[in-house]
Structure formats: structure tokens, C-alpha cells
């Protein structure tokens, strides 16, 4: 049986839109159906319709099709907003260029190349012919429009109104000539919908024949309209998935604009000392990845062959072996000179200060009255008066309404980490604003601490070295997997939430990650009965400078004999010096025959001042850090353990007091480890758990 082609790719979709006919003479036809695809197939074939179908509306609420012999450009018609409607217009009737020989062209050009008006197809004056609309059904020989019903070489043509000239081609440009792009086409939003070999593009909102991750609702800024060519992932030029099952995707033939300069809106802010956003504009000279491995030159093919060359990416400044972000990755990166590590991120480059001009706050910003109304990720704040119900849900006093004007960043709940606001995005209910503490402000944001001073953390590799294999129940320990390999540790603090480190996420694509719970062996050997494998649905980045991430699981973990949660400390608490604690990890461990088993190293808490002395005064610790030293020489956290916990026991209760982050040395005698102090961020963690929606089991 011949499979009917899916014709919805031939339509331009306008969501939440319908057409209203002002002219009562215009016909429409309706019928109950299940999907927009069914409407499209019938429209394309004109089956059972008393007119040539040019557009249709799918009514999602009533599951109904409305077929039209007109489109939004026709006279006697107007567009109207409607939540339940999606308008689909046949692209052939709205396109003003041709593809190939123009057989499918159904536009309204009616003048020949030399400027002669076309003769109507239904007329025999001045030229008799056999191209009757009735003989060429589906070829749309309407009015006197240029057409190419037989797909002949010269493109669309018509009989002319000049008795001396029987027929002539029309001057309709190729779509590939009309369309042009700048740079690598990341900002291209044109209407090219077929590949360089002529294959029709698959709609971005479809998953057949090719399943993919580029869902329009997931990437609203990437322009995934209909089935138009786009460049969302740093390819050399725009591309699309195709309707050919054996050609997953292909490039599109879009020429470079004569003036190949990027619009001001597309140019990333150039920086040389720090990273703004994802660092697409970083033009500095750092040339090693985060752990010190040197970068491979962009113009070299050794040790890694690649096509990310200066010739392919002329606008991206791929000079020497400097860290760059030419493809919209998480941050600047490079190919490495280690044959076993293809790429690495240069996460040691600091973020630029995001503060807006002179705007700053004192203490924790509860008295901040500036007029910034944007979150650190660029979302516009939503009005406080629309969110009062949510605010009351997590504070136990009446907020000062006089301060909560408009949608300005404020701190009505005494958040330790500064002003914030609600957003209109249901996935990110609220976030902090990009405002720094005022320079010279030393007001502690929490009490009971030594003098808070600024830290100067350096990035070094960390892994649990010479630890002993654990045997006790550590069901809260999580192995974060990146592209099927263990990359980091983490702690299960709630059924749907894992506390881990920011450095554990080299890619923004959440499909690259999984959380393994209930395992003892890093490869899951022998843990089959107790292992739970969960996808990751969201990353919530901690307050600026925290290095923390709360990772939301796609479904809640099932708590059992092998999987459990670990408690958080009270906000701002301190734990006595010499308290015995432990760090856990699967990082490679200094042993030649590494067995892949989870290991523990025993440490004890050390005061911040004493800790600083052990670091020979080169390190000053602040209120967001906690220090722990090894009981035996050379035992402590190292690479592969980032994100894992420093666990301490007090009053018979085990808590996660610290998180391992790239930091201050690896198991060096008399050099204690420095961890992110969870107690300092406990309120933030509780606030996220309380306000972010989680899936139900």
C-alpha cells in the first residue's frame, strides 16, 4: 500500500489565528477531524471541496477543519486572534519566488519578463491554446497569473496580451536568490523550506520521520516556524531535518548577503577579560580549558579533526588556540591537545560583572528601591500585584506593599542573596536580578560568622584520593551522567531535587544528562536491582557566585532501601570545629586498578581563619564557604567528585554541609579542602523547592 505523503509541510502556520470573511459570497467548508495533518492532506488534494483550497483553520477545541478558497492576503477577509485556532496557509499561494522550475508557483505575478501583461488562461484572445483550467486541474490556471503547469525549463510563463508575442517567461526570482544570510545564518529568519538538494524540510514541530530535540516551545528564540531552514546549533549555515528517512538533515542553499555584516541586535557584546552571557562575544586570549590542558589551534586538525575552522566561521574570531564560543554552547570552549579529550570548557574565565551602572544594594537589598525590572537571565519581571498570592505562600508576614511597586526588583522576603522578582515564565517562577552589593558594603548577610571577605578561588581538579570504599547506606548519593559517562556527584535532597555544582554541566541540552541513584559502582555493575535512572528536566542556578545548581528530575525518585534523601542544615548555622565529616565520590582515585566503587574520605571541620593559615594566608574565606581538613595525609576530594557532598553528623542527624566545587587543591598535606557552605544557601534551596513546580509521581 502506497503511503500517503504528509502535506502539512506545505503550509505556513499562524498560531492562535483564524480568518473571518467580510465578503459573504466567499465559501467555506467544515468537517470534524482529529488532526491538522488530516486537514492539510484534504486541502492539498482538494478532495470533496467545491473550490481550490488555499488555506485552512484547525479548531483545536472542537477538533474541526475549516477549509478556505482564500488566504490572509485575499480581499474580503480579515485575520482574527483566537486561542483555539491555528491558521495554515498553502505556501505556494503566498510565496513570491520559485523553487526549481517553479512548477508549484501559485503567486499573483501576471506580467512577463519584458513587461507585457499576461492573457487570461480561460481566454482564447489573442492566442488560441490548449492550456485550459479544466484540463490542468490542480495547476491553478487562474486569472492571468504566470504558471508552469508542465514544469518546463524556463520557469513560470504565460500567453501574452500582445498578439505579436505568443508567450513569454515571467521574471520571478529563485527563492535561493531572494533569501540571504549574514555570518553563519544564526539570525536567519527567512522562508527557505527545502535543502540544497531539493528535499522538503520537516516541520520543527513534527517528530517524523526524524525525532529531534529542537522543539519550538522549548527554544522560542530560535525561530522554529513551520519547516524553514534555521541554524540553532552553530553549524556553518542554516539547515533543516528532511522528509527523506535516510537524510536526517541537510544544509539549505542560502547565499550570503552582499553586505555580510551582522545587525546590531545580533552582535554579541565583545569582551576580552570576562564572559558576558554565554561568551559568544569573548575575544580574550585564554588558551587552556578549566583544568589547564592546552587548547588545540582552530586551524589545526591534530589531534582532533573538525570543521570548526576559521574559514567556516569567519565572524567568530577563531584565532590561534584561544577559547571561543562559535556554536552557542554553554560557554567558551576549545578542542584540546589531549587526544583522549575532544573538547573542554574554559570555565575558569570569570563572568563579567552583570551590575547595571551605579545600581547596587546594601546588606541583603531589602531596602533596595531602584527601578531595574529584569532578571539575571534577561526575563522581564512581572507585576508584584499579580503575584501576591504566591508571595504570601512563602513568607509569614505582611510584605510592605508600598515598596512593591510596578515590576521592579525587590526583596520582600528578606532573601540573603539580594533583590529578585517574579517572571511570567511558568518554568522559572522567580529569579534574582543582576544587581551587585555596593562596593565597600561589608554588612554580613547572615550573623555568627568571622569577618566576611572576598574569596579568590582558583580552579584545580578534584577527586576523592586514597579514600576507603563505602559500605554504609548512602542512598542520597547521585551519579550525574553526561553523555552516558559519570561526570559528577550530587545529593538527593528531595524526591525531585538534586543539589550539585554548576561546573557539572558542560552542555545546555538536558537530554545529555541522567541521574543514577541507588548505585555503589560507578558503572552500575551489580546494582541492577536497586538502580534508578532518571532524566533531568531543569537546572536552577544558584545565587551569583554560589557555584550551586539545583537539578530537577523529570520524575520523583522512589525512596526505598537503596535511595533516600539527605537533610539540609538550618540556614546560617555553624558547626563546631573538629566535627568529623565525610566526602563521597566516584572520581578516579589515585589507585592504579580503580574499581569504580563509591569512596569516602574522612575530614574534620576547621574554622575559616585557621583554614586560611593552612593555605599560608593566600586564601581568605567568606561567609559562603566551609573548610574541612583530612585526618590522614592525601585524602580528600578530587576531579569527578564535583557536586558531591561534605556530610557531617550532629545530634545523630546526617546533613549535607558542603558541596565539592573546583577549588583549592587536591589532597595536599596540611591543605584543607574548601567547600560551598550549604547553610549559607539553605533559604534559597527551600525557596526553590517551595516555588518551582515538580512532576507528580
Amino acid at each position: 500500500q502506497r503511503k500517503r505523503r504528509n502535506t502539512i509541510h506545505e503550509f505556513k502556520k499562524s498560531a492562535k489565528t483564524t480568518l473571518i470573511k467580510i465578503d459573504p459570497a466567499l465559501k467555506i467548508k467544515t468537517k470534524k477531524v482529529n488532526t491538522a495533518d488530516q486537514c492539510a492532506n484534504r486541502c492539498t488534494r482538494n478532495k470533496g471541496l467545491p473550490f481550490t483550497c488555499k488555506a485552512f483553520v484547525f479548531d483545536k477545541a472542537r477538533k474541526q477543519c475549516l477549509w478556505f478558497p482564500f488566504n490572509s492576503m485575499s480581499s474580503g477577509v480579515k485575520k482574527e486572534f483566537g486561542h483555539e485556532f491555528d491558521l495554515y496557509e498553502n505556501k505556494d499561494y503566498i510565496r513570491n519566488c520559485i523553487i526549481g522550475k517553479g512548477r508549484s508557483y501559485k503567486g499573483t505575478v501576471s506580467i512577463t519578463k519584458s513587461g507585457i501583461k499576461c492573457q487570461p488562461w480561460s481566454s482564447m484572445i489573442p492566442h488560441e491554446h490548449s492550456f485550459l483550467p479544466s484540463s490542468y486541474r490542480g495547476k491553478d490556471l487562474q486569472e492571468n497569473y504566470c504558471r508552469n503547469p508542465r514544469g518546463e525549463e524556463g520557469g513560470p510563463w504565460c500567453f501574452t496580451s500582445n498578439p505579436e508575442v505568443r508567450y513569454e517567461v515571467c521574471d520571478i526570482p529563485q527563492c535561493s536568490e531572494v533569501e540571504c544570510m549574514t555570518c553563519n545564518g544564526e539570525s536567519y529568519r527567512g522562508l527557505m523550506d527545502h535543502t540544497e538538494s531539493g528535499k522538503i524540510c520537516q516541520r520543527w514541530d513534527h517528530q517524523t520521520p526524524h525525532r529531534h530535540k529542537f522543539l519550538p516551545e522549548r527554544y522560542p528564540d530560535k525561530g522554529f516556524d513551520d519547516n524553514y531552514c534555521r541554524n540553532p546549533d552553530g553549524q556553518p549555515r542554516p539547515w533543516c531535518y528532511t522528509l527523506d528517512p535516510h537524510t536526517r538533515w541537510e544544509y539549505c542553499a542560502i547565499k550570503t548577503c552582499a553586505d555580510n555584516t551582522m545587525n546590531d541586535t545580533d552582535v554579541p557584546l565583545e569582551t576580552t577579560e570576562c564572559i558576558q552571557g554565554q561568551g559568544e562575544g569573548y575575544r580574550g586570549t585564554v588558551n587552556t580549558i578549566w583544568n589547564g590542558i592546552p587548547c588545540q589551534r582552530w586551524d589545526s586538525q591534530y589531534p582532533h579533526e573538525h570543521d570548526m575552522t576559521p574559514e567556516n566561521f569567519k565572524c567568530k574570531d577563531l584565532r590561534e588556540n584561544y577559547c571561543r564560543n562559535p556554536d552557542g554552547s554553554e560557554s567558551p570552549w576549545c578542542f584540546t591537545t589531549d587526544p583522549n579529550i575532544r573538547v573542554g570548557y574554559c570555565s575558569q574565565i570569570p563572568n563579567c560583572d552583570m551590575s547595571h551602572g551605579q545600581d547596587c544594594y546594601r546588606g541583603n537589598g531589602k531596602n533596595y528601591m531602584g527601578n531595574l525590572s529584569q532578571t539575571r537571565s534577561g526575563l522581564t519581571c512581572s507585576m508584584w500585584d499579580k503575584n501576591m498570592e504566591d508571595l504570601h505562600r512563602h513568607i509569614f508576614w505582611e510584605p510592605d506593599a508600598s515598596k512593591l511597586n510596578e515590576n521592579y526588583c525587590r526583596n520582600p522576603d528578606d532573601d540573603a542573596h539580594g533583590p529578585w522578582c517574579y517572571t511570567g515564565n511558568p518554568l522559572i517562577p522567580w529569579d534574582y536580578c543582576p544587581i551587585s552589593r555596593c562596593e565597600g558594603d561589608t554588612t554580613p548577610t547572615i550573623v555568627n560568622l568571622d569577618h566576611p571577605v572576598i574569596s579568590c578561588a582558583k580552579t584545580k581538579q578534584l577527586r576523592v584520593v586514597n579514600g576507603i570504599p563505602t559500605r554504609t547506606n548512602i542512598g542520597w548519593m547521585v551519579s550525574l551522567r553526561y553523555r552516558n559517562k559519570h561526570i559528577c556527584g550530587g545529593s538527593l535532597i528531595k524526591e525531585s531535587w538534586v543539589l550539585t555544582a554548576r561546573q557539572c554541566f558542560p552542555s545546555r541540552d538536558l537530554k545529555d544528562y541522567e541521574a543514577w541513584l541507588g548505585i555503589h559502582d560507578v558503572h552500575g555493575r551489580g546494582d541492577e536491582k536497586c538502580k534508578q535512572v532518571l532524566n533531568v528536566s531543569q537546572l536552577v542556578y544558584g545565587p551569583e557566585g554560589s557555584d550551586l545548581v539545583l537539578m530537577k528530575l523529570a520524575r520523583p525518585a522512589v525512596l526505598d532501601d537503596f535511595v533516600s534523601t539527605i537533610d539540609l542544615p538550618n540556614y546560617g548555622c555553624t558547626i563546631p570545629e573538629k566535627t568529623s565529616c565525610s566526602v563521597y565520590g566516584w572520581g578516579y582515585t589515585g589507585l592504579i586498578n580503580y574499581d569504580g566503587l563509591l569512596r569516602v574520605a574522612h575530614l574534620y571541620i576547621m574554622g575559616n581563619e585557621k583554614c586560611s593559615q593552612h593555605h599560608r594566608g593566600k586564601v581568605t574565606l567568606n561567609e559562603s564557604e566551609i573548610c574541612a581538613g583530612a585526618e590522614k595525609i592525601g585524602s580528600g576530594p578530587c576531579e569527578g567528585d564535583y557536586g558531591g557532598p561534605l556530610v557531617c553528623e550532629q545530634h545523630k542527624m546526617r546533613m549535607v554541609l558542603g558541596v565539592i566545587v573546583p577549588g583549592r587543591g587536591c589532597a595536599i598535606p596540611n591543605r584543607p579542602g574548601i567547600f560551598v557552605r550549604v547553610a549559607y544557601y539553605a533559604k534559597w534551596i527551600h525557596k526553590i523547592i517551595l516555588t518551582y513546580k515538580v512532576p507528580q509521581s
Epitope: Q235, R248, W249, Q301, R483
Partner: nanobody
Framework: EVQLVESGGGLVQAGDSLRLSCAAS????????MAWFRQVPEKEREFVAA????????YYADSVKGRCTISRDNAKNTVYLQMNSLKPEDTAVYYC??????????????????WGQGTQVTVSS
């Protein structure tokens, strides 16, 4: 545009060897990076091995490292996958894939544009 046809699959015993071939036509084979992926029913296609256009760079999935070798013969427009010490868990449909562009990654499905129909490999215990 590249067309790919795999061959060499079949039924073998655990511990045996097998050599898969993938013949390319209709494009410039020498300018394509090549890879093998495999798929078992109800699972996503998984990466097995890749080889750069020059043949100088190869990558392998951990699950096949040391047991599989990918190679290419640009004169014959063919890429090979030599599989030794086969295990029952190697049972899958094996697909050949071609890429015109390698960026930061070379092991994901989206790194490859053109795909063959697949050849079945069954390893019995």
C-alpha cells in the same frame, strides 16, 4: 547527496567476529566523516564508532572499545567496522552514517546527515 548501503550482518555465536561494510555513492566520500550507530527495538540509536574524513581520528563508544575497529578505504568509497569477541548485548541493527561537518561533537545522531537502511547483527549465546 550521499547514499549508504550496509552489508555483512548476520547471525553469529558469542565470541565470534564479524566485519560490517558500508558502501557510499552519490557524493564525495572523501569529504565525509563516517560513523556506525546501532539500535535495539524501543531504544534510541546509540553511537558505536566514528572515523574522520582523513582516517586520522577515530572515536569509540566505551562499550566496544578494544573489541571494534573502524576503518575506511577512500578509493573504494567504503567504511568498515571490524567487531571481535561479540557478546549477546551487541545484538542490534547497525547503521552507517555520513557527516559533512564535525563540530564540538562527533558521536550524536545529529552530527550525521546521511544514513543507511541498516544491517541486522544477532549474537546468540
Amino acid at each position: 547527496e550521499v547514499q549508504l548501503v550496509e552489508s555483512g550482518g548476520g547471525l553469529v555465536q558469542a565470541g565470534d567476529s564479524l566485519r560490517l561494510s558500508c558502501a557510499a555513492s552519490g557524493g564525495t566520500f572523501g569529504s565525509s566523516h563516517m560513523a556506525w550507530f546501532r539500535q535495539v527495538p524501543e531504544k534510541e540509536r546509540e553511537f558505536v564508532a566514528a572515523i574522520s574524513r582523513s582516517g586520522g581520528t577515530t572515536y569509540y563508544a566505551d562499550s566496544v572499545k578494544g573489541r571494534c575497529t573502524i576503518s575506511r578505504d577512500n578509493a573504494k568509497n567504503t567504511v568498515y567496522l571490524q567487531m571481535n569477541s561479540l557478546k549477546p548485548e551487541d545484538t542490534a541493527v547497525y547503521y552507517c552514517a555520513a557527516a559533512r561537518f564535525w563540530g564540538s561533537t562527533s558521536t550524536r545522531m545529529d552530527d550525521y546527515q546521511y544514513w543507511g537502511q541498516g544491517t541486522q547483527v544477532t549474537v546468540s549465546s
